[in-house]
Interface confidence: low
């Protein structure tokens, strides 16, 4: 049985192959229940997370996990050597930077070790599940009387990057967002010296060097000009 | 012949156009003059007429496809030329190689639209016209606003370093009259230079409430 | 200023062989990484390979991954792209680029080597 999973990270080409043994008719063997779906998650390009729903399991158990490359030179089947664990129960498995290779097929397959015909594989591709660090270092420069710029910086190759930009004053109810490219820099080519305004970044792996859909966590907030907390009643509603 | 200093510039809208300029001081008026464009890697050629658009410089436009076909790409080099006619025999001006994604001028911002006034502030919005794929999101846009009393000379630019197609402009005076326009530049190209302003979209702020302190 | 300059392109039959090189100029070449990136006839640009300023770290897109091999000489300001196996779909306009700015901005891009894949 080959079934496509469509996981929130756009992995649409990701598919799980579940190994049956026979079984009576009366009953499902333990060997028919499904495994749990397994998130890999490369962030930074530093480490990988892999984890599963290990509390999806009718009774405690340690899953264990493989991951190998297909059709690479790094095709040897791996064991996990670093597990996550959540309640003492294996949760997950954490992947040094020396072993992710992002442009080349991960496979990974989770096993019942107490059931070893109990597994599913996966096959991902990681250059669409990197999630970079947030932005750091938000600085405005005054560009003229009314004009600001936003710079930041990523820990991550910039030519990979995309970001989104949201600023909000004092006075609004909502963020206003911009899309911006790899050059981490954004023009607010108009501003209100009497509002208070507040700017964050997040940042995604693409479209260049992946097609990633998940974006980097917030940068901390940067702020620019005065509060008029006076006359406007949405100030408060900033830091909710 | 023709004598004196002799200025041969073109641009390409990153599209199906090329437009030149040619000035000669001291050409004679009633020439007739062409430039012809011989690309390097296409099977096509153009030519357009030169006209003139002042005492010593003449213009035309090479209409290279559809508005919005891809013509050319970075890597074409097309050879430009200035030919007029002596008698029954053509004679070469000026010559140029050109490498059309080195030298861009994109078509000015179309479709300006006031989106939301309030008595301070304006958002406005606008489309880039004919600009190709290749650019992704590479352009940056200058603005600029014309209060009452000013020139468009004396109106501060305004810059945006991201492709944003539109600007909230904020501080408005109430229930006053201005202008708009906008212009882009791709971020590719040395010799590459801003678009023509828009066409300038006027619009009104609204009134101050009544017995309010504005 | 900074200057990349390819060469190698060429017309090459389906299953051949091409090098692409990159001589880089106007920068310390050791301390960046570098990429290659492609644009075939009317299409985007597409990224191809990676790599880090050490040139231990190689990064390549899947459509490449076991024909092309990338490397650079950081003594000889060099950047090379080893491309077997091609196909008619590797036809394109190939870009080394300087890793800090891939991208068709121009500000540190080469003017490309065509290279065309054809029987």
């Known amino acids: 049985l080959n079934t496509t999973i469509l996981t929130p990270n756009g992995n649409e080409d990701a598919t799980t192959d579940f190994f049956l043994t026979s079984m009576p008719t009366d009953s499902l063997s333990v060997s028919t229940l499904p495994l749990p779906e397994v998130q890999c998650f490369v962030f930074n390009v530093e480490y990988m997370n892999c984890t599963w729903n290990s509390s999806s399991e009718p009774q405690p158990t340690n899953l264990t996990l493989h991951y190998w490359y297909k059709n690479s030179d790094n095709d040897k089947v791996q064991k996990c050597s670093h597990y996550l664990f959540s309640e003492e129960i294996t949760s997950g498995c954490q992947l040094q930077k020396k072993e992710i290779h992002l442009y080349q097929t991960f496979v990974v397959q989770l096993q019942d070790p107490r059931e070893p015909r109990r597994q599913a594989t996966q096959m991902l591709k990681l250059q669409n599940l990197v999630i970079p660090w947030a932005p750091e270092n938000l600085t405005l420069r005054k560009l003229s009387e009314s004009q600001l710029e936003l710079n930041w910086n990523n820990r991550f190759l910039n030519h990979c990057l995309e970001h989104l930009v949201q600023y909000r004053t004092d006075w609004d109810h909502s963020w206003t967002e911009q899309s911006v490219d790899y050059r981490h820099k954004f023009s607010l080519p108009s501003v209100d010296g009497q509002k208070r305004y507040t700017f964050r970044v997040r940042s995604r792996f693409n479209p260049l060097c992946g097609s990633a859909q998940h974006w980097s966590e917030w940068s901390h907030p940067i702020h620019w000009g005065s509060n008029s907390s006076k006359e406007n009643p949405f100030l408060f509603a900033l830091e909710a | 012949a023709v004598n004196g200093t002799s200025r041969f510039t073109c641009f390409y809208n990153s599209r199906a156009n090329i437009s030149c300029v040619w000035s000669q001081d001291g050409a004679l008026q009633d020439t007739s003059c062409q430039v012809h464009a011989w690309p390097d890697r296409r099977r096509w050629n153009q030519t357009c007429e030169l006209l003139p658009v002042s005492q010593a410089s003449w213009a035309c436009n090479l209409i290279l496809g559809t508005p919005d076909s891809q013509k050319l790409t970075a890597v074409d080099i097309v050879t430009l030329r200035v030919m007029c006619r002596e008698g029954v025999r053509w004679r070469m001006m000026a010559i140029q190689d050109f490498k059309p994604f080195e030298n861009l001028r994109l078509m000015a911002p179309i479709s300006l639209q006031v989106v939301h006034v309030e008595t301070h502030r304006c958002n406005i919005s606008w489309k880039i016209s004919q600009a190709s794929h290749y650019f992704e999101r590479h352009l940056e846009f200058e603005a600029r606003t014309l209060s009452p009393g000013h020139t468009w000379e004396e109106a501060p630019l305004m810059t945006l370093k991201q492709k944003q197609e539109w600007i909230c402009l904020e501080t408005l005076t109430p229930d006053t009259q201005y202008e708009f326009q906008v212009r882009v530049k791709p971020l590719q190209g040395e010799f590459t230079t801003w678009s023509p302003w828009s066409q300038p979209l006027a619009f009104r702020t609204k009134p101050a409430a009544l017995g309010k302190d504005t | 200023q900074v200057q990349l300059v390819e060469s190698g392109g060429g017309l090459v039959k389906p299953g051949g062989s091409l090098r692409l090189s990159c001589a880089a100029s106007?920068?310390?070449?050791?301390?960046?990484?570098m990429s290659w990136i492609r644009q075939a006839p009317g299409k985007g640009l597409e990224w191809v390979s990676s790599?880090?300023?050490?040139?231990?770290?190689?990064y390549y897109a899947d459509s490449v991954q076991g024909r092309f091999t990338l490397s650079r000489d950081n003594a000889e300001n060099s950047l090379f792209l080893q491309m077997n196996s091609l196909r008619a779909e590797d036809t394109a306009v190939y870009y080394c680029?300087?890793?800090?700015?891939?991208?068709?901005?121009?500000?540190?891009r080469g003017q490309g080597t065509l290279v065309t894949v054809s029987s």
């Open positions: 680029a300087r890793g800090d700015a891939v991208s068709i901005t121009g500000d540190y």
């Open positions: 106007g920068f310390t070449f050791s301390d960046y990484y």
């Open positions: 790599i880090s300023s050490s040139g231990d770290t190689i």
